[in-house]
Structures are given as C-alpha cells and as structure tokens.
Interface confidence: medium
C-alpha cells in the first residue's frame, strides 16, 4: 500500500522559518503534489504550493521556495511574519496524486518537544485520505 510521509522542521536561525518535506512511498508515477496548511487540501486547508512534473511549481505566501528533492519527494521552505506566519502547532499536509494508485495525503506538524533546528525523522505519517 502506498504511503505518504511528512516531516516538519523549524529552522534554528530563523524561528519563523519552517521546512516541510514530504515523500511518496509507492511505485506509481506522481502527477501532482499539493502542500497545504491548516488541514487537508479541500477540507479547510490553504494551499501553499502545487508541484506538477510538466507545468512546474506554483507557490503562495508565505511559501518561499518549493522544490522537488527526488522524483518522489519534495521540500517547501516557509517564512512569515505577522498574520501569515506559521506557528509551532500548525498542521501541514501533502497530497500526492499518482498513477495508478490515485491520491494519497498525510499531515504532520512540528514535534511538540522539538527545539529549533531539530525535527522528528521522516517516518510515514498517518494516511488521512486515499481517493
């Protein structure tokens, strides 16, 4: 069964800066990745970035840089100040659409006990939805 993992890290140098890394553990070809915060995409969450293998990357503030790390994983750097700034308990979600598996989504947030610059290892997060 395909899985999605999500890792959230707060940068030690900039406390309002977060790095989100997501990956897809499956054999299919990824056709779209959507990163959102505040909940799953389409269920109250706000889209931060969309990554498409052909059409490229779209990102919205406070996303600063979204990129493919491998053909099946992505990273997103967020920076914010004021109302648009993420906070320590913000939930980030990644949805991977792939062929032939369909869509798989998982969410994660900063580990409660983590110090800036530290993070939990990128273990698979619970799968919230598989379309």
């Amino acid at each position: 069964t395909p899985e999605v993992w999500v890792q959230v890290r707060m940068e030690a140098t900039e406390l309002s800066s977060f790095t989100i890394r997501c990956g897809f553990l499956g054999s299919g070809s990824i056709s779209l990745v959507t990163v959102s915060w505040g909940g799953p995409n389409g269920a109250g969450g706000t889209t931060l970035a969309v990554l498409h293998p052909e059409r490229g990357i779209r990102q919205w503030a406070p996303a600063r840089q979204a990129r493919w790390e491998t053909q099946s994983s992505i990273s997103l750097i967020l920076e914010g100040s004021g109302a648009s700034s993420p906070c320590a308990n913000t939930t980030f979600c990644c949805k991977f659409a792939s062929f032939p598996e369909g869509s798989w989504e998982a969410c994660g947030s900063l580990p409660p006990s983590s110090d800036p610059g530290l993070s939990a290892p990128p273990t698979p997060a619970p799968i919230l939805r598989a379309d």
Epitope: S31, E54, R55, G56, Q65, A66, R67, W68
Partner: antibody, heavy 122, light 106 residues
Framework: EVQLVESGGGLVQPGRSLRLSCTAS????????MSWFRQAPGKGLEWVGF??????????EYTASVKGRFTISRDGSKSIAYLQMNSLKTEDTAVYYC?????????????WGQGTTVTVSS | DIQMTQSPSSLSASVGDRVTITCRAS??????LNWYQQKPGKAPKLLIY???SLQSGVPSRFSGSGSGTDFTLTISSLQPEDFATYYC????????FGGGTKVEIK
C-alpha cells in the same frame, strides 16, 4: 530524426482566425507536452501556451494576452499539435514556433520547429 | 508571473574571449532555469537546462550556474559560431524569458 514542422501561417485581417499545425516525427508524440511560442519582429521570445502529455491528461495553459482567443489541442493519431487563433489582433503578428516539451518541466524545450510567420494586418 | 531580467542586453567580444551573461528572477526559482541560443531567422536551441545541466550535443565551452534568483551563462572561449542572441527562461508556467543578450563581434 526527431523533428517538428509548423504550417498554416500567413496574412490575415484583424478579427479573423487562423489555425497553425505542428507535425511531429521521430518520437512518441503522446509522451511529451507540446508548447507554442512566438517572436514579434525584432523582439524576444514569448510563451503562448502549452498542452500536457497524454499521461497528464492534456491540460492546457495560456499566457494572459491570448487566453480566451487561442486554443491548443493535439491529435495523437496524427502526431499533430494545433494552435487555433481567433479574434486576431495586429499585436499577434509574429513568427510562431512549436516546441517539444517539457517532458519534465526542469528539462526545457529540447526540440523546436522552424517557425511559421503570422501577419495580422488590414 | 515571474519576471526575468537579463544583462547585458548586448555585448561585443572577440573569438577566444570568455563571455558571461547574467539572468535574475523576480522570485526564487530554485534551479529551474534554461538557456537558449538563437541565430537570426532560426529557431531557439536549448543549451543548458536546470541551471547547470548541459544539453546533449552542446559544446562543453558552454556552462551554467546559479540557484534561487541569480544565474549565469558562461562561454569559456567564444567561437565564431557562438555569435547569436541568448535567452534565459524560467521553467514553471506561465513560462517567461529574459529580454535576450546579443553577442556581437568586436
């Protein structure tokens, strides 16, 4: 040999329509997105639009200035990409190029046609 | 849309010269930048993709570097066939190009 050949250009009056064709050979047409570009006389390159590969559902996207007037389509059985241009304006005068790609957007457009000239004038 | 600013708009150089062209994006585009060469009356030709990867068949005197917002195309030793116009292009739709740099004979 991998090749793209455009056709269909010519002189057309403002407000009229024209359809350009881009005939592909030497590669598996359905595996690639196809893009259209244009270059006005003495100017730089401008992206016109894009149609995704068969795998990605053939999605289309256009530059703002042609949205609603131009339509890109593809015929996999003939290995042809089309650019249907309606409500043409004098500022659409340019050499139009089709290009293969991107197969993955980071790869760029690696094969281009020779271009076809469209002149919009009364 | 992401704006691409290329400089210089033109330059004069001699055969054997090292030539550097720069391109700046209005926001970070990671390494998703391509470079093209175009000669008068001809279609563009892909030289460099993903900022620094040399397209197959392109001479090794061409190289690209940069990441984020600032990028460079370098021709290590200019050859007679290199006199042309060069364009940078960012890779996410809507695709946008720099204004071009015309490399002329000094």
């Amino acid at each position: 040999e991998v090749q793209l050949v455009e056709s269909g250009g010519g002189l057309v009056q403002p407000g009229r329509s024209l359809r350009l064709s881009c005939t592909a050979s030497g590669f598996t047409f359905g595996d690639y997105a196809m893009s259209w570009f244009r270059q006005a006389p003495g100017k730089g390159l401008e992206w016109v639009g894009f149609i995704g590969s068969k795998f990605y559902g053939g999605e289309t996207e256009y530059t703002a200035s042609v949205k609603g007037r131009f339509t890109i389509s593809r015929d996999g059985s003939k290995s042809i990409a089309y650019l249907q241009m309606n409500s043409l304006k004098t500022e659409d005068t340019a050499v139009y190029y089709c290009a293969r790609g991107p197969r993955r957007y980071t790869y760029g457009m690696d094969v281009w046609g020779q271009g076809t000239t469209v002149t919009v004038s009364s | 849309d992401i704006q691409m600013t290329q400089s210089p708009s033109s330059l004069s150089a001699s055969v054997g010269d090292r030539v550097t062209i720069t391109c700046r994006a209005s926001q970070s585009i990671s390494s998703y930048l391509n470079w093209y060469q175009q000669k008068p009356g001809k279609a563009p030709k892909l030289l460099i993709y993903a900022a620094s990867s040399l397209q197959s068949g392109v001479p090794s005197r061409f190289s690209g570097s940069g990441s984020g917002t600032d990028f460079t195309l370098t021709i290590s030793s200019l050859q007679p066939e290199d006199f042309a116009t060069y364009y940078c292009q960012q890779s996410s739709t809507p695709l946008t190009f720099g204004g071009g740099t015309k490399v002329e004979i000094k």
